[in-house]
């Protein structure tokens, strides 16, 4: 997996004027890292995970950094045309890696209204666009917008690359990051489906990074993938991550089946607890 | 006592179909998870087949999947294996086998039928 | 498709001697190997599940060992009804059998 730092612009407009405010999201390696949710923007760390790598230190570069980005896409949103009444967002997300080989890469996108209309590689210069009629539409407004000012495309977008991989590798250096592992914590519960039936979840949570393999097993071989429901690997919050996976089983063959886990090369089994059902009600739809 | 013992072997032509049948004793066949594994003449073993105690999870080997079927009827207590487009390197001894139901178990098979030859002939 | 590589394919042996067959994991299977025995015109016999653990009423002079992608079955000392074929299984990935190792009278 590559290091990554991804940033997540947001600014809305009500009745074709652009409001004030906007709503920005910074990522660390996939996890929630910075957030600038206010009027006035501060920076401020997701968690004490962020603050380990940030340090002892304020957020100023980081405040300063993100308003001007906020300032920058607030233009862009009032220079779409046609904007419809009520209300409409314009949204940047910007995201550069560090591979494992040291080589980079670096790109950024635009959404309206959640629509991805624009694209640009940030090395190369590149940009690219879906082929639908709207977002073309969009873009060539956006990109004739950026190109108006000159000096700002090649000022201010042809350095988004550097400084965004110069930050990463300014976060990447507190040594918090840097290629960690956290095993999960893994349990199994169980619940009354149906008549004769119950679903058993097992959860893992707390595990960094984020690739895991959870399956449940039966005498050792693996359900089919349908058989099974998975959930999204998501952030918990701490700097790790949290996801689960359910099957419907026969009441009275619980021992026959384990749940399966693997994570960066370590791997376990977890079988159903035996005895009374602890929850009623199931989440299997 | 526990055995499997299967039938419906015998000679077919290429392109051919064949049914195989394995009947339980001894045991309810309802809760195991099944197999069919193959030997042919002076070789060694190959899964062909698994499908499980509830019928949700069914494998094949890539050199039958698209023409074998695997099924079970566990009200008559019996493994099926439906062969179509049957070719010569289907010639074998077919084995129809039982997952273990041990705590622990890592997909081990206890307890195996004696065996039905199939022939394929061009 | 995880593959299994047993070695020898065949090897010559005396009643009483210690023997070790390998089977190889084309990627790590973790313990999900199991051994069987099989003799001429016979159907295989479990022996070792889980990687080590012994099937119920098979003798203790077979063991099973590794984890991964290297795995042991040792006989500690050969019995005469202990010459025949035998293979290795893994349920990790889909099942696949090994090619089998013979054992046969020096």
């Known amino acids: 997996e590559p290091h990554s730092l991804r940033y997540n612009l947001t600014v809305l407009s009500w009745d074709g004027s652009v409001q004030s405010g906007f709503l920005t999201e910074v990522h660390l390696d996939g996890q929630p890292f910075l957030r600038c949710d206010r009027q006035k923007c501060r920076a401020k760390p997701q968690g004490q995970w962020a603050e380990d790598v940030l340090g002892n230190k304020t957020w100023d570069r980081e405040t300063r950094d993100l308003t001007g980005n906020g300032k920058d896409l607030r233009m862009t949103l009032a220079h779409i045309k046609d904007q419809k009444e009520g209300l409409h967002s314009l949204q940047e997300i910007r995201v550069c890696e560090i591979h494992e080989d040291n080589s980079t890469r670096s790109s950024q996108h635009f959404y309206y209204d959640g629509e991805l209309f624009l694209s640009q590689n940030l090395e190369t210069k590149e940009w690219t666009m879906p082929q639908s009629s709207r977002a073309q539409t969009l873009a060539m407004n956006v990109r004739n917008f950026l190109k108006e000012d000159a000096m700002k495309t090649k000022t201010h977008y042809h350095a988004m690359h550097a400084d965004c991989l110069q930050e990463l590798r300014r976060y990447l250096k507190s040594g918090v990051v840097l290629r960690r592992t956290v095993p999960p914590m893994v349990n199994v519960t169980r619940s009354e489906a149906s008549e004769g039936n119950i679903t058993v979840t097992c959860r893992a949570s707390g595990f960094y990074p984020w690739n895991i393999t959870l399956s449940w097993r039966q005498d050792g071989v693996s359900l089919s993938h349908d058989t099974q429901q998975w959930g999204d690997v998501l952030p918990d919050g701490n700097g790790t991550y949290q996801t689960w996976v359910a099957t419907r089983i026969c009441q009275g063959e619980e021992q026959r089946f384990t749940c399966y886990m693997e994570h960066s090369g370590n791997h376990s089994t977890h079988p159903v607890p035996s005895g009374k059902v602890l929850v009623l009600q199931s989440h299997w739809q | 006592q526990v055995q499997l013992v299967e039938s419906g072997g015998g000679l077919v032509q290429s392109g051919g179909s064949l049914r195989l049948s394995c009947v339980a004793s001894?045991?309810?066949?309802?809760?195991?998870?099944m197999n069919w594994v193959r030997q042919a003449p002076g070789k060694g073993l190959e899964w062909i087949s698994y499908?499980?105690?509830?019928?949700?999870?069914?494998y094949y080997a890539d050199s039958v999947k698209g023409r074998f079927t695997i099924s079970r009827d566990n009200a008559k207590k019996s493994l099926y294996l439906q062969m179509n487009s049957l070719r010569d390197e289907d010639t074998a001894v077919y084995y129809c086998?039982?997952?273990?139901?041990?705590?622990?178990?890592?997909?081990?098979?206890?307890?195996w039928g004696q065996g039905t030859m199939v022939t394929v002939s061009s | 498709e995880t593959t299994l590589t047993q070695s020898p394919f065949s090897l010559s042996a005396s009643v009483g001697d210690r023997v070790t067959i390998t089977c190889r994991a084309s990627?790590?299977?973790?313990?999900?190997l199991n051994w069987y025995q099989q003799k001429p015109g016979k159907a295989p016999k479990l022996l070792i599940y889980?990687?080590?653990s012994l099937q119920s009423g098979v003798p203790s002079r077979f063991s099973g060992g590794g984890s991964g992608t290297d795995f042991t079955l040792t006989i500690s000392s050969l019995q005469p009804e202990d010459f025949a074929t035998y293979y290795c299984?893994?349920?990790?990935?889909?099942?696949?059998f090994g090619g089998g190792t013979k054992v046969d009278i020096k």
């Open positions: 086998a039982r997952v273990s139901d041990i705590t622990g178990n890592t997909g081990a098979f206890d307890i």
């Open positions: 990627q790590s299977i973790h313990n999900y």
């Open positions: 889980a990687a080590s």
């Open positions: 499908i499980n105690s509830r019928s949700n999870t069914i």
């Open positions: 299984q893994q349920s990790y990935n889909a099942l696949t």
């Open positions: 001894g045991f309810t066949l309802s809760r195991y998870s």
